[in-house]
Interface confidence: medium
């Protein structure tokens, strides 16, 4: 029995152009959390047994709000270790999957929305009881720095935590703090005492008095970051002047692995370790299955009978996206009519209607004309939450109470003269024109270009508009 422990040191934009400024979407603040998944062996696990060694979820990190114009920072992280207990022997070889998740905290009814920001996969050999192993991985435009170790718990000891150390009732012949182990009758196991001052976080020892540094650290006590040491971890030909290695291009520069795959150098080439759901030389081919639990927010996963076939997420109401990871903005469809205000309550839509309208979608026009009369034979027309009068000819104004001059707008064309009449207006047309508004020219031979004058009316005679 024992515990696998993962410590996230930093998560932030990777180096180079195009790095994201913020993990949050435009909708507002967010916070991060991490999920770790362990699988035994170095080969890809079958779809039916994900996280067979165990999985753990971190606490939520502090709320992050993007600061405009500020440099993109390392993001605030959850406190503490991620711990994955294991009951049986530690396998020694394992696959480690670390997922970085974003929880959006904008004004979202029905709770925050989650989305996967980054996923890294490492296949590793690791003995239990050893020092912290440190790693830096890129996932797309993001960079994750972390350390991990496996340690035995209770009375288990050894690189696989399989040997039991049973305290004996008889006093031990070993010194204080040393554990007598049953299989080793007169021997004791104890961690060696490292050189005084050796960094607890970045150094370790296998022999008493030594101080060996984890990757990324240097100096006699492992307190100097490697980036400040001029000769640490560089590739390429040796420089005659400094004796240091001069950097040269490596096959993993620029990270050729897509979809969050991590790159390892091989002689003259590279190898991509792909996260679950992706495969191919550069992790460019997707193969996520339902056994990975890819559908969020209560979604249902449907795949073929073949475990390696593609999947489809059936999303519950209010969610969309290939993984049901997006909250539907149902108000974007503008379901409220007549200028109503749309409110998405998560479980339902609500329309707040303007005055004069009602109904679930503000589709009902209330009777704006009730109790309102239009004078002088005008008729009331509903619309826009207020009444409007369509007035009889010769009247105008909101309630048709004002007498209107039908000739004020000069309705008679081509010099025709306008006469007010009890039922409207009459145009007396100038010679050569005819029509109710004198709009039609008359041909010189007396034949009109458009409808002939009705019987009893000659072109040029006044015509009453009926």
């Amino acid at each position: 029995a024992g515990v696998f422990e993962l410590q996230i040191h930093s998560f932030g934009p990777g180096p180079g152009p195009g790095a994201p400024r913020s993990p949050c979407s435009a909708r507002g603040p967010c916070r991060l959390f991490f999920r770790v998944c362990l699988k035994p062996g170095l080969s890809e696990e079958a779809a039916e047994s994900p996280c067979a060694l165990g999985a753990a979820l971190s606490a939520r990190g502090p709320v992050y709000t993007e600061q405009p114009e500020a440099p993109a920072p390392d993001l605030p992280l959850p406190n503490g270790l991620l711990q994955v207990p294991f009951r049986d022997a530690w396998p020694g070889t394992f696959s480690l999957i670390i997922e970085t998740w974003r929880e959006e905290l904008g004004d979202q009814i029905g709770g925050p929305a989650w989305s996967l920001l980054a996923r890294v996969t490492r296949r590793r050999r690791l003995a239990a009881g050893g020092p912290w192993a440190r790693d830096i991985q890129r996932a797309g435009a993001w960079e994750l720095r972390f350390s991990y170790r496996a340690r035995c718990e209770l009375l288990a000891v050894g690189t696989a935590c399989t040997r039991l150390c049973r305290p004996r009732s008889a006093p031990s012949r070993c010194g204080p703090g040393l554990r007598p182990c049953a299989p080793l009758e007169d021997e004791c196991e104890a961690p060696p005492v490292c050189r005084a001052g050796c960094s607890l976080e970045h150094g370790f020892c296998e022999q008493p008095g030594e101080c060996r540094c984890l990757e990324g650290w240097t100096g006699p006590l492992c307190t100097v970051p490697a980036s400040t040491s001029s000769c640490l971890g560089l590739r390429g030909p040796s420089s005659a002047t400094t004796g240091c290695l001069v950097p040269g291009p490596g096959p993993c520069d620029g990270n050729p692995c897509a979809n969050g795959g991590s790159c390892s150098e091989t002689p003259g080439s590279f190898e991509c370790t792909c996260p679950r759901g992706f495969y191919g030389l550069r992790c460019e081919v997707s193969g996520v299955t339902c056994a990975d639990g890819p559908c969020f927010n209560g979604g249902l996963c449907v795949g073929g009978a073949d475990p390696d076939s593609a999947y489809i997420c059936h999303c519950p109401p209010g969610f969309q996206g290939s993984n049901c990871e997006k909250r539907v903005d149902r108000c974007s469809l503008q379901p409220c009519r007549n200028g109503g205000l749309c409110l998405d309550l998560g479980h339902a839509l609500r329309c707040r209607c303007r005055a004069g309208f009602a109904g679930p979608r503000c589709e009902h026009n209330l009777d704006d004309c009730a109790g309102r009369a239009c004078a002088n034979g005008g008729t009331c027309v509903e619309g826009g939450g207020a009444h409007r009068c369509s007035c009889a000819l010769g009247f105008g104004g909101r309630d048709c109470r004002e007498r209107a001059d039908p000739c004020a707008a000069r309705p008679c064309a081509h010099g025709g003269r306008c006469y007010a009449h009890f039922s409207g207006l009459v145009c007396a047309c100038a010679p050569g024109y005819m029509g109710s508004r004198c709009e039609f020219p008359v041909h010189p031979d007396g034949v009109s270009a458009l409808p002939a004058a009705p019987p009893g009316l000659r072109p040029g005679d006044p015509q009453r508009y009926l």
């Epitope: 999985a55 639990g293 890819p294 519950p316």
Partner: nanobody, 130 residues
Framework: QVRLVESGGGSVQAGGSLRLSCETS????????MAWFRQAPGKEREGVAS????????YYADSVKGRFTISQDNAKNTVYLQMDSLKPEDTAMYYC???????????????????????WGQGTQVTVSS
């Protein structure tokens, strides 16, 4: 249309047994976490047991450990809840639910909460009298 159909509820004396069944389609059955919940009058709906039919260990709430057993029949796309040594406090409406989880997450108390599940059966009533 997602379909989860429960059956097997009924009335029984304390100490007796019942077996509930939840049948669904082959695709939903094989690809999702299947869980049993129960809701007693005036109480919250609580997770009782869960299983990922494609593999993985089952999960049981502390209140039913040792008395209830969740099992499956792959040929019938059905998940069962065998309820033995029933107590009056087991009286409730029992619901079958399904959702996408990884196998590991299906077997956790934090995973088997009502808010995580969007697809439910219509429920079957279990009444235990003393």
């Amino acid at each position: 249309q997602v379909r989860l159909v429960e059956s097997g509820g009924g009335s029984v004396q304390a100490g007796g047994s019942l077996r509930l069944s939840c049948e669904t389609s082959r695709y939903i059955y094989g690809n999702n976490c299947m869980a049993w919940f129960r809701q007693a009058p005036g109480k919250e709906r609580e997770g009782v047991a869960s299983i990922y039919p494609a593999g993985g260990r089952p999960y049981y709430a502390d209140s039913v450990k040792g008395r209830f057993t969740i099992s499956q029949d792959n040929a019938k796309n059905t998940v069962y809840l065998q309820m033995d040594s029933l107590k009056p406090e087991d009286t409730a409406m029992y619901y079958c639910a399904a959702r996408s989880f990884s196998i590991a997450d299906c077997a956790t108390q934090s995973g088997i909460t009502r808010s995580n599940f969007a697809y439910w059966g219509q429920g079957t009533q279990v009444t235990v009298s003393s």
